[in-house]
Every structure is written in C-alpha cells, then in structure tokens.
Amino acid sequence: AESHLSLLYHLTAVSSPAPGTPAFWVSGWLGPQQYLSYNSLRGEAEPCGAWVWENQVSWYWEKETTDLRIKEKLFLEAFKALGGKGPYTLQGLLGCELGPDNTSVPTAKFALNGEEFMNFDLKQGTWGGDWPEALAISQRWQQQDKAANKELTFLLFSCPHRLREHLERGRGNLEWKEPPSMRLKARPSSPGFSVLTCSAFSFYPPELQLRFLRNGLAAGTGQGDFGPNSDGSFHASSSLTVKSGDEHHYCCIVQHAGLAQPLRVELESPAKSS
C-alpha cells in the first residue's frame, strides 16, 4: 500500500516538436498507476484507465487543467530564456508523498536534456541550481506573475489535498488486484538449445516475480522483460536457454499479489502454442 501514497506529475516539454505532436505533455501518477494525461494539443487534463470512473467533484479536472496550463506556459517560456540554441527537452518531476505520519513531503526537480539541473527550494521559495541554464530559466520564471508562490501552493497544498482526496474517492482503484494470465512456451534456439519463455499478461499491481524450476529445483530467473499496457495493467516475461529435449523438466513459478499462492506454470504442448 505504501507505494500508492504518492502523487507525481511527470512533465515534458520539447523546444522543437515534430509537426502534429505536442510541445508539452504530462502524465500524472498515483503510486504506480497513471491517473492523468495532458498535452498541449488538447489542452485538457483527462483521467486515465479506471480513474475515468472515480467519483470526483465536478470541478476537479478543470482545476487540474488550469494548473497544467500554467505549467505549460512556464515550460515553454523556459526555452525562450535559453535562446535559439537547442534542441532542448525540459522535464519536471513535481508532486508529493505522504509519510507514515501522514505529513506531506514535496518533490520538485527538473532535468534539461536528461540531466537533473534545477530544483524548487521550498524554504527559499525559489528555483535553485548552478548551471547557467538553471539561472536563465529561474530568472525567467521569477518574472512570471506569482510563479514561485503558485509553485509553493501547488507543492504544499494542492498536491497533498489531491492525494488525500484520491486515497478516499479512488480507494477501489488503488486496491485493484488483477492476477496475471500465464504461458510457458519453448522455441528452438541455437543448435542443441531451446529458449523457454514464461509470460505474464494483464496483471496489477506491477510487482511480480517469475522464476524457473528444473525438476523442482531452482534454475534461475532468466532474462526478463517488463512493461505497461494501455489499460493500466502490466505484462512481463522471462526467458531461459535450456538443452533441447530437456524442456519438459522445467516449469515457471509466478508470485503476485493477485494470487493467493505462487502459481506453477507448466510447459504448453506444441499443439497448443501454435
């Protein structure tokens, strides 16, 4: 449950967007779940996945939209401060986390072309960093009407308030557990060897463990792959190279919060895996 106690906005702006693509976009995350998306082409904050059904107050998404339009303006202003050089990608990670004592810990850091270079200092109420680019951007942002105050308000009040609201109103989403559907398949590899692939589909939360057994004994975790699905669930797979003809000695064990106990997955027969 602790991983759910954070609300983070991942903001990205590009100085030279490709035609028809946004110059600025945001994904909002409640723990490991994306609940919000925004981009400069649509200009509206929208709920994602199961959060479409959250019983929110009528003006909630208008407020998210207003705040993100302000952020969009700031981020695109930053490129003007940097001058004509580039291209640039500016990223922000803004949000808050609820500690064990229910106090809020804010986060506000920024990266330029993939390098963290600036933060927002709550005590000093200003953006900090010592790269020349950080000074140029922070100077520009300080000149925007009440920008620093708005950032403080966002981090210290709006964010924890929203997080607590979601914890109340969206508890069903946060407690969602979807067990994985599983497959264990074999395919020929280099001469004399096969690759066993254990695949887990459509599970949530994202924490999942895959491992192989050979005749009941641990045979390793293999080479893994992991990623999100468009509906908010996740997929994962792990592959292990074994001797040809030895495949039937292996099985895959999966552990996941949606399963009452670890699940043993046997190798599919060749006919079934077609």
């Epitope: 790269w131 020349p132 300080q142």
Partner: antibody, heavy 118, light 113 residues
Framework: EVKLVESGAELARPGASVKMSCKAS????????MHWVKQRPGQGLEWIGY????????NYNQKFKDKATLTADKSSSTAYMQLSSLTSEDSAVYYC???????????WGQGTSVTVSS | DIVMTQSPSSLSVSAGEKVTMSCKSS????????????LAWYQQKPGQPPKLLIY???TRESGVPDRFTGSGSGTDYTLTISSVQAEDLALYYC?????????FGGGTKLEIK
C-alpha cells in the same frame, strides 16, 4: 574580459566576523552562479557554497552552514561572503569563482586572505 | 558526500617526460542518460588562484595547451601531460560537480627535476 576582483586581506580577532567582497565585471552578473572556496595554508581546496545572484538562492556545504553567509548585490555586480564567530581554523585564503559551465567553475578571483589572531 | 582521492600526492619529473595523475571518486560521476562526466581538473601555481584545465572529464578549456588531456569515466579519471614543461610546476586538483557539496581531491603536486 571576465574579471573577479576580491577585497583585500583581513586580520581579525577570534569571535569576530569579516565580510569580504567579489566584484564581477566583463559579463552579466545575474546570469551565472558565484561559488566560494576555502584554502588553508599549504592545504587543499574546500567548497563552501554558491549563490544565484538573480534570485538570491543559496546552496551551502553543511560544514559551512553556520559559518558563512552568501549575499549578492545586483546593482553593483558584487558578491559577498560573511564569516562569523572566527577561530584560527578560519585562517585561510577564500576565493570566489564563477560557474560559467555546467561541470566546472571557469573564472576565479585572486583570493582574500583572512588571518585570525589574538 | 562524494569523496575524491588523488594519487600520487606528489611526483617529480624531467621536462619533456609524460605524466599521468589519477583521481578516484567514491561514487560514479557519470550521467548514464547522456554519458557526461561531472568532473573538472584545475591547475594551481604558487601564489595564484586555481585555473580550469579540463571539464566534463575530457573537454579542454579554451587556451589550455593540448599537451593536457583528461580521460576516464564513472569513478576513475586521469589527467595526462604528454610532455611536461617547466611552467607546468603546480598543484593539480580534481573536483566533482555531480552533487553538492562539490568536493575536491587532495591534489597532486608536480615538481620539475
């Protein structure tokens, strides 16, 4: 030409305070962070902290948090460092240095020598 | 704090010889996202402030002779002087700009025989 000119040598009593200056010229003062570095006689370099002259934002080495106070005056393009509650450990040369690059400070002042003696 | 360790603490060479000095950090100074290293080398001659030689581990500051070369990545860095000149008599410091507090190595003193 970028120049950082620091104030003259200081002789101070233990317990006193000193305030040294670093006047910048040849560039836009508010566009670059000003760092301060300490060097005791025959010793290495120690980073004290930096100030962003445009906003007044400061970042200190915890070791110097209660010792040094960094300020900047935009109108005169001058950065200042005040050292308080001086002891013999504070006897050193103090440098101001501009961070004109992402990964280094590129220009240094000539240094201000502080001697603490009773 | 990141600890920077330089070696040797001093070395004595004849003019024209090649010199290498080492700087090791207690944690990586490499930004894996863009392969940039947050390390600089400075030269300090007696009675003078330090002077920037190399930044980003390997980029020579303008006006610095090309006999000075910086290399390395992660936690291990090297400054090489390909053919030492009499005017290279100085202390050489490395400094990390990866995270505050920015820390310096203890320095390597180069003496000319």
């Amino acid at each position: 030409e970028v120049k950082l000119v620091e104030s003259g040598a200081e002789l101070a009593r233990p317990g006193a305070s000193v305030k040294m200056s670093c006047k910048a010229s040849g560039y836009t003062f508010t566009s670059y962070a000003m760092h301060w570095v300490k060097q005791r006689p025959g010793q290495g370099l120690e980073w004290i902290g930096y100030i962003n002259p445009s906003s007044g934002y400061t970042n200190y080495n915890q070791k110097f948090k209660d010792k040094a106070t960094l300020t900047a005056d935009k109108s005169s393009s001058t950065a200042y460092m005040q050292l308080s509650s001086l002891t013999s450990e504070d006897s050193a040369v103090y440098y101001c240095a501009r961070k004109g690059l992402r990964y280094a400070v590129d220009y240094w002042g000539q240094g201000t020598s502080v001697t603490v003696s009773s | 704090d990141i600890v920077m360790t330089q070696s040797p603490s001093s070395l004595s060479v004849s003019a024209g010889e090649k010199v290498t000095m080492s700087c090791k950090s207690s944690q990586s100074l490499l930004n894996s996202g863009n392969q940039k290293n947050y390390l600089a080398w400075y030269q300090q001659k007696p009675g003078q402030p330090p002077k920037l030689l190399i930044y980003g581990a390997s980029t020579r500051e303008s006006g610095v002779p090309d006999r000075f070369t910086g290399s390395g990545s992660g936690t291990d860095y090297t400054l090489t002087i390909s053919s030492v000149q009499a005017e290279d008599l100085a202390l050489y410091y490395c400094q990390q700009h990866y995270s505050t507090p920015y820390t310096f190595g203890g320095g390597t003193k180069l003496e000319i025989k």
